[in-house]
C-alpha cells in the first residue's frame, strides 16, 4: 500500500511567493513559493496519485507582516483552503500567548492540531480540551494511518506559552501514544512534530512503532541528488534512521518558509512495516503556475496589510540614528533600541533563580540600514521600521561559549575604520576596545550582565561558560564573517521577524528615547 | 493479525485443472496484494505471480503464463489460483503470500499423478 | 529475469557461532531484498525486509546489510531453533526470483 506524504514547516507567514532567498518578492518572474503555488502543486499530485497526505510541522506563525496584522487568523484560512490533513504545534504558535493560538487557529482550524508532549493544566485543561490532541487517526484509501505529534519542549524559552501549559519530553510522551495507535490496530504511525532535526532522528530511533518521521524547527534541507536551488543539503531524503528494534525509519523535512512541498513516497506492507521510501522536495519556482483562486483571496487579504504599515506604531522623541556614519563606528542608538527590544521580547521568567533566561544581544551595524527621523511628529511606522531592517530576517536565540563572543568582538574591530558592516552593536554587553592594539587582541575588556542574579549586574566575560544570546540569524548563520558563530554555537533557534521585534517593543513603550550610554568604548 | 488460510491438498490427473483458495483476515485486504509461490519437494522456492485485491489486476511470471489464472472474492477476502494443464512437475506446496511476504498461508500440496 | 545466486548452498556450525550468508543479484536490486527462514516441517517465516529491517518478533542476532547487487544475512551467535534453510527473495523487478537456499545444518 503506496502513501504519498506531502510536508511543510517552518513556513513562518510565507502566504505570498518570496524572492529565492525568501525575503520580499521583486522581481514576480523568478519569485518561489506561496500558498497560491503549493496549491498548485498539491493539487497535481491529489489528481494523480490515491492516497495523499498533505501535513504541516509547525512555525506557520511568525514571519511577515501578515502574521503581524491577522495573526494567525490567515494561517487558519489558507491552511483549511489547501485542505491540510494535520498540523503539529511549534513554538512560534505560542508567540501570541495560548489565546492567540486557540482563537485564531484552534477554533478555527479544520484539520486536527497535534501534540503529545503538552500537557494543559489548571483552568486552562478544560478550555483548551479536545482543541489540539495527542494523535489523530486519520482515514487514507482504504487504509487508516495514525499521526502522533510533538512540539520542542524549549518553547518556554522560545515562545510566549504561559504557567499552564507543560512541556514534557518528546520520546517519553509519545512513546504511550503510539502504544495507543497500535492497541487501536493503527500499524502504520507518522510522527509529525517541531523539536528539530536532531530530535527527529532520535524519536525515529527511540520511539518503538513510529514508522516516519516528519520534522521542522531546525530548517533542515534533505536532498537526494543534484539540489535545485542554493540550498545545501545536510542529508539524503529521506534520511534514514535504524531504530533500536532494527527497522529503518525515514526522517524527512523541508527546509523552510514555503520554497519546498516536501514529497515522500512510502510502501508498506500488510503489518504496517515500511518496505520502501523515496522522494524529494519540490522546488516550487516560478515554473509552476500560481492558483487563479487561491492568489484571488491572496490579493483580497493583502488590502489591509497595506493600509496598516502606514499607521503610527508609536513615537520617537530622539533622533533614531541608524547611519551607517554612526552604527558601522561606535555605539548608535538604533543599535540599542533594536537590542533592547530583542531582549525585551525574550523575557521569559521560567526560574526564581533567574531574572531571565537571555540577557545579551549582538547586532551588526552593518544591518541597521536607515535612521529614523524624529521631526515628522516622532510618528513611527511599520514602512519606517522597514526601511531599517529591509533583509526580512529573524532575531534568535543562540548558545555560546564566553571564548567564542571574544572571537566574535575581536572580529568586530579587526579592520576598523572601513565601514563595514561586522562592527557590533549591543545590549547586556560592555565592550572596551583599543584600537592602537593589532586586530584580533584589541578587546581589552568585556563585561556581560548577569542573569542568575535578582539584580542584574556586569561581570567579566568568562571564556568556558555557555551564554545565551540573542542576535540576527545573519550573524548566527556566519554572516559578515562571522563563522566563528556558525562554526561554535552549542544551539540555535529561530525567533521572530526582526521588524515585528521590534515594532512590538514600540508599540508596547510608546514613547521612546534612546541615548548613547557607553555600551561600547 | 494477519492469517492467510488456504485449502486442502489436491490430487489430480495430467491435463487437469487445479483451483487452490487463500483467505485472508486482521488486514484491509483491498489495500493489497498476493503472491502465490511453489515449493517442488525438495527444491527450493518459485514465484508465479501476483494479484491486486481492490482490481484484479495480475503479473505472472513468464513461465506460467497462458496457464495460470489469479482472482479475487472481495467479498470474503478470498484469492484463488487455477493452474491448468498439469503435468507431473507441477508437483509441489503452494502456498499464497502477504505484498511482501511478511506472512503465508500453510501451504496446499498439489500432487500430479496419473 | 533477475539472478539470485546464493552461497554458500549448505553450511554445518555449532550453537553459538556466527554465521553469514550471502546472496548475489545478476544486477543491481536497490534495497529490495529479503531474507526468509523454513523450517523443516515448512513453515516460511520472514526475518529481514527491505535488506536490513527486522521483522518484528525476530530476534536481533539476524541482521541484514548490503547494497547494489551483494547482500548478507548475518546470524551472531547461532542458537539450536536457528537451524533451518534461509532464502534470499528480490522484489525490484517482476519477475520475483529466490536465492536457490541454504540450509543451516547442527556440525
Known amino acids: 500500500w503506496e502513501l504519498t506524504i506531502l510536508h511543510t514547516n517552518d513556513v513562518h507567514s510565507r502566504l505570498e511567493q518570496t524572492s529565492e532567498d525568501s525575503s520580499k518578492c521583486v522581481n514576480a518572474s523568478r519569485c518561489m513559493g506561496g500558498v497560491a503555488r503549493l496549491f498548485t502543486k498539491v493539487q497535481q499530485i491529489r489528481r494523480a496519485e490515491p492516497n495523499v497526505l498533505l501535513l504541516d510541522a509547525g512555525d506557520q506563525y511568525q514571519g511577515t507582516i501578515w502574521f503581524t496584522v491577522y495573526k494567525g487568523a490567515e494561517v487558519a484560512h489558507f491552511m483549511n483552503a489547501l485542505r491540510y490533513d494535520a498540523m503539529a504545534l511549534g513554538n512560534h504558535e505560542f508567540d501570541n500567548g495560548v489565546e492567540g493560538l486557540i482563537e485564531p487557529l484552534l477554533k478555527e482550524a479544520k484539520f486536527p492540531i497535534l501534540s503529545a508532549n503538552i500537557k494543559a493544566k489548571g483552568p486552562l485543561a478544560s478550555q483548551i480540551s479536545g482543541l489540539y490532541l495527542p494523535y489523530k487517526v486519520l482515514p487514507v484509501g482504504d487504509e487508516v494511518v495514525g499521526i502522533v505529534g510533538y512540539t520542542s519542549k524549549e518553547t518556554p524559552f522560545l515562545s510566549n506559552p504561559g504557567t499552564n501549559l507543560v512541556f514534557e519530553d518528546e520520546i517519553t510522551a509519545l512513546q504511550p501514544e503510539v502504544d495507543k495507535l497500535k492497541t487501536l490496530n493503527v500499524n502504520k504511525i507518522i510522527a509529525l512534530g517541531h523539536s528539530g532535526f536532531e530530535m527527529d532522528k532520535l524519536i525515529a530511533q527511540k520511539v518503538r512503532g513510529v514508522d516516519v518521521v516528519v520534522g521542522g524547527h531546525s530548517n533542515t534541507f534533505l536532498y537526494t541528488g543534484n539540489p535545485p536551488s542554493k540550498e545545501v543539503p545536510a542529508g539524503k531524503y529521506p534520511f534514514i534512521v535504524t531504530s533500536d528494534d532494527g527497522r529503518k525509519v525515514p526522517v524527512v523535512q523541508a527546509y523552510a518558509f514555503g520554497k519546498y512541498l516536501g514529497y515522500l513516497k512510502i510502501e508498506f506492507d500488510e503489518r504496517g512495516n515500511v518496505i520502501s521510501s523515496h522522494g524529494n522536495p519540490i522546488l516550487l519556482n516560478s515554473s509552476i503556475p500560481e492558483d487563479p483562486s487561491i492568489k484571488a483571496d491572496i490579493n483580497k487579504w493583502r488590502i489591509k496589510l497595506d493600509n496598516y504599515s502606514t499607521q503610527e506604531l508609536g513615537k520617537t522623541i530622539v533622533y533614531l540614528d541608524g547611519s551607517s556614519q554612526s552604527c558601522r563606528f561606535r555605539e548608535c542608538n538604533m543599535g540599542n533600541l533594536i537590542c533592547d527590544a530583542m531582549i525585551n521580547n525574550n523575557l521569559r521568567h521560567t526560574d526564581e533563580m533567574f531574572w531571565n533566561h537571555v540577557s545579551m544581544c549582538i547586532l551588526n551595524g552593518g544591518g541597521i540600514r536607515s535612521p529614523i527621523d524624529e521631526r515628522n511628529n516622532g510618528t513611527i511606522t511599520w514602512e519606517n521600521l522597514a526601511a531599517v531592517l529591509p533583509f526580512g530576517g529573524t532575531f534568535d536565540l543562540v548558545q555560546l561559549k564566553g571564548s567564542t563572543l571574544k572571537k566574535a568582538f575581536e572580529h568586530s574591530v579587526h579592520r576598523y575604520g572601513q565601514s563595514t558592516g561586522e562592527f557590533l552593536q549591543v545590549g547586556g554587553i560592555h565592550v572596551v576596545y583599543d584600537l592602537s592594539r593589532k586586530p584580533g587582541d584589541r578587546v581589552v575588556k568585556l563585561d556581560v550582565l548577569c542573569t542568575k542574579c535578582r539584580v542584574p549586574s556586569y561581570d567579566p566575560l568568562k571564556m568556558d561558560e555557555v551564554y545565551k544570546v540573542i542576535l540576527p540569524n545573519f550573524l548566527a548563520n556566519g554572516g559578515d564573517g562571522f563563522q566563528m558563530i556558525k562554526d561554535e554555537l552549542l544551539r540555535h533557534d529561530s525567533g521572530d521577524q526582526d521588524i515585528n521585534v521590534v515594532s512590538t517593543y514600540i508599540s508596547k513603550m510608546k514613547v521612546i528615547y534612546p541615548a548613547v550610554e557607553g555600551r561600547i568604548k | 493479525e494477519v492469517q492467510l488460510v488456504q485449502s486442502g491438498a489436491e490430487v489430480k490427473k495430467p491435463g487437469a485443472s487445479v483451483k487452490v483458495s487463500c483467505k485472508a483476515s486482521?488486514?484491509?485486504?483491498?489495500?493489497?496484494?498476493m503472491n502465490w509461490v511453489r515449493q517442488a519437494p525438495g527444491q527450493g522456492l518459485e514465484w508465479m505471480g501476483r494479484i491486486y485485491h481492490n482490481n484484479g489486476d495480475t503479473f505472472y511470471s513468464q513461465k506460467f503464463k497462458g496457464r495460470v489464472t489469479m482472482t479475487v472474492d472481495k467479498s470474503t477476502s478470498t484469492v484463488y489460483m487455477e493452474l491448468s494443464s498439469l503435468r507431473s512437475e507441477d508437483t509441489a506446496v503452494y502456498y499464497c503470500?502477504?505484498?511482501?511476504?511478511?506472512?503465508w498461508g500453510q501451504g496446499t500440496t498439489v500432487t500430479v499423478s496419473s | 529475469d533477475i539472478q539470485m545466486t546464493q552461497s554458500p548452498s549448505s553450511l554445518s556450525a555449532s550453537v553459538g557461532d556466527r554465521v553469514t550468508i550471502t546472496c548475489r543479484a545478476s544486477?543491481?536490486?536497490?534495497?529490495?531484498l529479503n531474507w526468509l527462514q523454513q523450517k523443516p516441517g515448512g513453515a516460511l517465516k520472514r526475518l529481514i525486509y527491505a535488506t536490513s529491517s527486522l521483522d518484528s518478533g525476530v530476534p536481533s542476532r539476524f541482521s541484514g546489510s548490503g547494497s547494489g547487487s551483494d547482500y548478507t544475512l548475518t546470524i551472531s551467535s547461532l542458537q539450536p531453533e536457528d537451524f533451518a534453510t534461509y532464502y534470499c527473495l528480490q522484489y525490484a523487478s517482476f519477475p520475483w526470483t529466490f536465492g536457490g537456499g541454504t540450509k543451516v545444518e547442527i556440525k
Open positions: 544486477q543491481d536490486i536497490g534495497d529490495s
Open positions: 503470500a502477504t505484498s511482501y511476504v511478511g506472512d
Open positions: 486482521g488486514y484491509t485486504f483491498t489495500a493489497y496484494f
